[in-house]
């Protein structure tokens, strides 16, 4: 019968008795940087080419016995998970292996850097189709390794890495912390985060998504027909490398940004029990388990967006946090969040020719996060319109006045320390959805975009009594681009997008002890692109 992990990543329409996806990733080459491998295992023979690259440190210990099957164990298993004939994800993908880990599974930053340079040179000498690089390894944070990953990603290579098995914030490790890399955490057959002894999968904002990573059956280097179960974020990353190979084989022109957005879009949502993660990491960790798309074609018509969290600003009074989108993505909205509720909002600002999302801490605050909504919007022309704090009691408002521009997001930023505690609510006048509204003491920023066929609408959900969380979701066919809170009298901790749902968090009612603090309204801006839909229909 089909192994649980292959069943889990397979959409229902492909599920027969056996795992037989429509295309095996045959147009894609996957580079594996790992241990040596047993290339004559029948699961991978003829699919994996062992390069002559080897850069590994000496094994520790005087009594270490180098046993071939042990040296090959990790790499052989991962090669099998990616492209194995029987238990592999992308059964048609070809692989090349580089040895950067020794028989104890240890490597060096320099060895990995030289390995990445080897791939870059190979790509220049003999350009092939799409390339996926699998980095099933994790070490301490390394600026130089992250920079090397960035260079390779910007050269058009898709890098997939393990989040790490330290039950820790993945941002503390490399290459997991490199923004350009697709970072993968591990889940089990129950869609729960994988526990490995006293440790387990890493988590946090640097993780892009999770994938099966416990009891994964794959080729064993023990013998030519042997299989074995292994667990960890390396196995999870191998699944995503395989899925990426399948997607790229079906659509070879996909950019890294497009691929990442599709991986996120087609993932299973909200299936992971977040209680396993530390409380402060739950909101930052994506609740996504990777899956193959239900069809390898026809996804082009959708407007894809993802949420990008910044690093924590730190608690100093003037501290700020910045969230950035990938080079090919548009920043369509910006929001902020603070656990203490002490923040001075957020704004979109230009930095290096690109918009970024900056959140501001307030005096006495424990720090803030900036949350960017990053979308794929071809031929977009976006700008930010700002209204300074208003004198009038009606509050500050700003709209998209340019012809053909639509509102995709609202942000507000204020200088006063404790805005919103006892201010009267501001109501948006009916029939004027294309504008942002805020406190009169706040400056309001509207993200306005023009793109072929782009249409957006505002959707609100207000709750009269105070609630810790208020949500509003975009309906089928529409994509959430903006998420904010209508200024009310309740103490809002912030707003952020989770998949297609806008979440507004307020201070815990039980801690405020008051029930008279009034309404909380979540405001979602939902968009779609008729142009993308038409283009997709024409292609078919």
């Amino acid at each position: 019968s089909i192994p649980w992990n292959l069943e889990r990543i397979t959409p229902p329409r492909y599920r027969a008795d056996e795992y037989q996806p429509p295309d095996g990733g045959s147009l894609v080459e996957v580079y594996l940087l790992d241990t040596s491998i047993q290339s004559d295992h029948r699961e991978i023979e003829g699919r994996v080419m062992v390069t002559d690259f080897e850069n590994v440190p000496e094994e520790d210990g005087t009594r270490f016995h180098r046993q071939a099957s042990k040296c090959d164990s990790h790499g052989t298993h991962l090669a099998g998970v990616v492209s194995g004939r029987d238990a592999g994800v992308a059964k048609g993908a070809s692989m090349r292996s580089l040895r950067v880990l020794n028989c104890q599974g240890k490597g060096t930053v320099s060895g990995t850097l030289i390995g990445l340079e080897f791939i870059r040179k190979s790509q220049l000498v003999q350009p092939v189709g799409p390339l996926v690089v699998l980095l099933p390894l994790a070490g301490g944070y390394s600026r130089v390794l992250n920079a090397a990953c960035q260079r390779l990603a910007r050269a058009g290579v898709v890098l997939v890495t393990a989040a790490g098995n330290f039950r820790d914030d993945a941002c503390l490790y490399s290459p997991a912390s490199a923004p350009e890399v697709i970072t993968v955490g591990a889940t089990n057959a129950q869609d729960q985060p994988v526990t490995l002894g006293t440790l387990g999968t890493n988590f946090g904002r640097c993780v892009d998504l999770f994938a099966p990573g416990e009891d994964i059956i794959g080729a064993s280097s023990d013998c030519s027909t042997c299989f074995v179960s292994q667990s960890g974020t390396s196995q999870a990353a191998a699944h995503v490398a395989g899925i990426a190979a399948m997607m790229l084989s079906a659509e070879p022109e996909l950019t890294l940004a497009e691929l990442r957005q599709r991986l996120i879009h087609f993932s299973a949502k909200d299936v992971i029990n977040e209680a396993w993660f530390p409380e402060d990491q739950r909101v930052l960790t994506p609740n996504l388990v990777a899956a193959l798309p239900p069809s390898t074609h026809g996804a082009g018509w959708q407007l894809f967006c993802r949420t990008v969290w910044s690093a924590h600003s730190g608690p100093t009074r003037m501290a700020t946090a910045v969230a950035r989108c990938a080079p090919d993505e548009e920043l369509l909205s910006c929001s902020s969040f603070s656990r203490s509720g002490k923040r001075r909002g957020e704004r979109m600002e230009a930095q290096g020719g690109k918009l970024v999302c900056r959140a501001h801490n307030a005096f006495g605050g424990e720090g803030v996060y900036a949350i960017a909504r990053c979308c794929l919007l071809p031929q977009a022309n976006c700008s930010v319109h700002t209204a300074p704090p208003a004198e009038a009691s009606m509050g500050t408002r700003v709209h998209c006045h340019q012809q053909g521009h639509v509102l995709t997001g609202c942000s507000s930023h204020w200088e006063v320390e404790d805005l919103g505690t006892h201010k009267p609510p501001v109501l948006r006048p009916r029939g004027q959805p294309n504008q942002c509204v805020g406190h009169r003491e706040a400056s309001i920023h509207a993200s306005c975009c023009h793109a072929p066929g782009l249409e957006c609408k505002v959707k609100e959900h207000g709750i009269p009594a105070p609630q810790e969380q208020v949500t509003v979701a975009c309906e089928e066919g529409w994509t959430l681009t903006g998420c904010s809170a209508l200024p009310g009298t309740s103490h809002v901790l912030g707003a952020y997008a989770v998949d297609n749902t806008c979440v507004v968090r307020s201070r815990d009612v039980s801690t405020t002890g008051s029930t008279s603090e009034g309404a909380v309204t979540a405001v979602a801006i939902c968009c779609r692109s008729r142009h993308l839909a038409q283009a997709s229909q024409e292609l078919q």
């Epitope: 008795d17 056996e18 004559d40 004939r85 029987d86 059964k91 042997c226």
Partner: antibody
Framework: QVQLVQSGAEVKKPGESLKISCKGS????????ITWVRQMPGKGLEWMGM????????RYSPKFQGQVTISADKSISTAYLQWSSLKASDTAMYYC????????????WGQGTLVTVSS | DIVMTQSPDSLAVSLGERATINCRSS????????????LAWYQQKPGQPPKLLIY???TRESGVPDRFSGSGSGTDFTLTISSLQAEDVAVYYC?????????FGQGTKVEIK
Amino acid sequence: QVQLVQSGAEVKKPGESLKISCKGSGYSFTDYYITWVRQMPGKGLEWMGMIYPGDSYTRYSPKFQGQVTISADKSISTAYLQWSSLKASDTAMYYCARDYWSKPFFDVWGQGTLVTVSS
Amino acid sequence: DIVMTQSPDSLAVSLGERATINCRSSQSVLYSSNNKNYLAWYQQKPGQPPKLLIYWASTRESGVPDRFSGSGSGTDFTLTISSLQAEDVAVYYCQQYSSFPITFGQGTKVEIK
């Protein structure tokens, strides 16, 4: 039910070519390996090689490498064993059998094809 | 190549009596990663293809009578027919399926005494 059906007995002269077949039914043909086993008159079983019809990956025993060719046509769920130039010593019963990645032993066998090579 | 050696070459046993066939591999077919012995036993009756009896050294194939049992580990294995029946007259082969080329023992012919 699951079965492997082999082509009928063949009588050939030395130097002639031959292609015998093994058709699978009752299971997903591309997910199983097909192996060929030789049994010379009054002798034991010898593994010749195998094919994975899913991608036509083949592996041969060193003894038979270059002597025979194993192939498959997954569209008709059939595997083949062929010789380009038969020898008298190729006279034997040839069996096909299947195996699966998690069960790499031969659970289903064809009925056998007797090949006689004589001048 | 892993060499499989069976003993005896032939065996004559009375009906209802125990028949024991031994098989030795030139290297271990037990693998630590899954703790399995990659060894199978087959029965071949005259004019018929071989039939799988035992796999993983000791697991009986479905439909095989429980008088057939397999034991052993590493390099030494045994097939036991606890109470020989007339229909058990055949040649029995052991086979390792862990390393290529896959190899069989030379066979043990079981007859009725």
